[in-house]
């Protein structure tokens, strides 16, 4: 869990490149002091700031760990020794997280809080994006185009990575029903040094605020604070959150007493997670034990399957997974308004999917 060894390794590798090879202990300073040339000035200060940022990101899981505390204390000592300020540029991170800042091109440095621009500058192409959605009972469309109907109750993570945490809380749609619906969504935009303060967004049925938990509508006072924003086109029923610093757009909707979640996210961001963060419905879909087959319907109310199909067909002419989800929801809830959730999910997918050939998924059962 504590990733201090990774921070140590990244620091060593960045100082090795400054030295042009050779070996170095994780916290050996090297080079002259002050603001002079060589390793002892700008380059080392950038590496130390990156090291400090890395320790900060892993701090909570490392609290009480001797190696962690030694590293942080050592960084402080080296920054004092080399007269480094804590604010300023950091060394380019290794190619694990979401895109690297542009380097050595002679062009102006890309905005560190504009993910797409930064990625395009570095790779000469736009980034790849992934789409995930949760709606209705809930039905989950994963990044990898799995489509499951889940019986999950309580709080389940849709996403849990280095940049984002999204948790959906579900409860039974009706007494005795197998199916559940999402009543609450919690989204955490994790602290990102240059760009945003940590921000929490929480929505519940009949309470879709157009603000973060602290009352703000952006990422805070940092230089890139505007790279996280929240808005609505339909107060009380729709909220859109743009997180440009991680190439992400999230839409939350309320229909028929349940919440829907839809996300378009940069691939590198979506995949920046460790082995311990393996339970994510957007990554793996519903765990097999939590999946409902369509044969597990327990119909309520007076709506027949033919009526449900007719209602759903109006807005969903293709008999794909969205159509079948719609029929399922209308039958189980007895509420024709559930057609809207599936229709909106399909529209979000149309807007968010990079490959429209994957828009219509067809269930196997």
């Amino acid at each position: 869990q504590c990733k201090i060894l990774r921070c140590n390794a990244e620091y060593v590798s960045s100082t090795l490149s400054l030295r042009g090879g050779g070996s170095s202990g994780a916290l050996r300073g090297g080079g002259g002091g002050g603001r002079g040339g060589g390793v002892g000035s700008g380059g080392l200060c950038r590496a130390l700031r990156s090291y400090a940022l890395c320790t900060r990101r892993t701090a909570r899981t490392c609290r009480g760990d001797l190696a962690f505390h030694s590293a942080v204390h050592g960084i402080e000592d080296l920054m004092i020794q080399h007269n480094c300020s804590r604010q300023g540029p950091t060394a380019p991170p290794p190619p694990r997280g979401p895109a690297l800042p542009g380097a050595g091109s002679g062009l102006p440095a890309p905005d560190p809080c504009d993910y797409e621009g930064r990625f395009s500058r570095l790779h000469g192409r736009p980034p790849g994006f992934l789409h995930c959605a949760s709606f209705g009972d809930p039905h989950v469309r994963s990044f990898h185009h799995h489509f499951h109907t889940c019986r999950v109750q309580g709080a389940w993570p849709l996403l849990d990575n280095d940049f984002l945490f999204v948790q959906a809380t579900s409860s039974p749609m009706a007494l005795g029903a197998n199916a559940t619906a999402t009543r609450k969504l919690t989204i955490i935009f994790k602290n990102m040094q240059e760009c945003i303060d940590q921000k929490v967004y929480q929505a519940e049925v009949d309470n879709l605020p157009v603000a973060f938990e602290d009352g703000s509508i952006n990422g805070g006072d940092r230089p890139g604070g505007s790279s996280l924003s929240i808005q609505t086109a339909n107060p009380g029923n729709h909220v859109e959150i743009q997180a440009a610093y991680i190439g992400t757009t999230i839409i939350i909707r309320q229909t028929a007493g349940q919440l829907s979640f839809s996300i378009k996210v940069a691939e590198d961001v979506a995949m920046a997670f460790s082995a311990e963060q393996d339970l994510q419905l957007c990554v793996g879909g519903c765990p097999p034990s939590q999946r409902l087959s369509r044969s597990e319907r327990n119909r309520r109310g007076a709506i027949t399957i033919d009526t449900a199909r007719r209602l759903c067909k109006e807005g969903l002419p293709v008999e794909d997974a969205y159509f079948h989800s719609c029929v399922f929801d209308v039958l189980i809830s007895g509420d024709p308004n559930f057609t809207v959730a599936a229709q909106a999910a399909l529209e979000d997918a149309r807007a968010f999917l990079p490959d429209l050939e994957k828009l219509h998924l067809f269930p196997s059962d």
């Epitope: 609290r63 505390h69 804590r86």
Partner: antibody, heavy 120, light 108 residues
């Protein structure tokens, strides 16, 4: 809205124990540590230590080790701090606070405080 | 162990600027946070990471930190700013949060 609500005032005899509760709401309880800080009458703030509700890990200042126990119940998003072998020097207001360790090294929301009076 | 020293008191007239210092060895290498505590109330975070303000805190509160001194500046002081102010850092080697001795700000 983030809120920390603490249990009410306590009067204890020397040698006894006190258990202070801190009910958290408005955020994901397991995503932040809880810190405990105390303030003797007319004195400054004294940091006691922290606990991670997710892992159960704790860290307390040496002077409290051996007589402090920090626990939590994640189902009811409540943290507890129990201090034993009380003396008159433990008379203070005890605060819990949300500890942004990592995303910041600060305490961004505080409980209202619990006055513990130790008197024979 | 790491120590933070603050002046016991600072007096300032309404509308003027109050500056509260927090001294510590190479404090400039650490993140400094400031809390306001009014009588009978819990502390409130007013500045974090040297100079950032939590939402809801007026722009009149600002901070700086370099060398051996961090400073909390309250401009255009109001009667409602009368309180005790504490600086705080994290002592990385000890894993302790350390509070300053506290400064009582009196608005004349």
């Amino acid at each position: 809205e983030v809120q920390l609500v603490q249990s009410g005032a306590e009067v204890k005899k020397p040698g006894a124990s006190v258990k202070v509760s801190c009910k958290a709401s408005g955020y994901i309880f397991t995503n932040y540590d809880i810190a405990w800080v105390r303030q003797a009458p007319g004195q400054g703030l004294e940091w006691m230590g922290w606990m991670n509700p997710d892992s159960g890990n704790t860290g307390f200042v040496q002077k409290f080790k051996g007589r402090v126990t920090a626990t939590s119940n994640t189902d009811i998003t409540t943290a507890y701090m129990e201090l034993s072998s009380l003396t008159s020097e433990d008379t203070a207001v005890y605060y819990c606070a949300r500890d942004r360790f990592g995303s910041g090294y600060d305490l961004d929301h505080w409980g209202q405080g619990t006055l513990v009076t130790v008197s024979s | 162990s790491y120590e933070l020293t603050q002046p016991p008191s600072v007096s300032v007239a309404p509308g003027q600027t109050a500056r509260i210092t927090c001294g510590g060895n190479n404090i400039g290498s650490k993140s400094v946070h400031w809390y306001q505590q009014k009588p009978g109330q819990a502390p409130v975070l007013v500045v974090y990471d040297d100079s950032d303000r939590p939402s809801g805190i007026p722009e009149r509160f600002s901070g700086s930190n370099s060398g051996n001194t961090a400073t909390l500046t309250i401009s255009r002081v109001e009667a409602g700013d009368e309180a005790d102010y504490y600086c705080q850092v994290w002592g990385s080697s000890s894993d302790h949060y350390v509070f300053g001795t506290g400064t009582k700000v009196t608005v004349l």
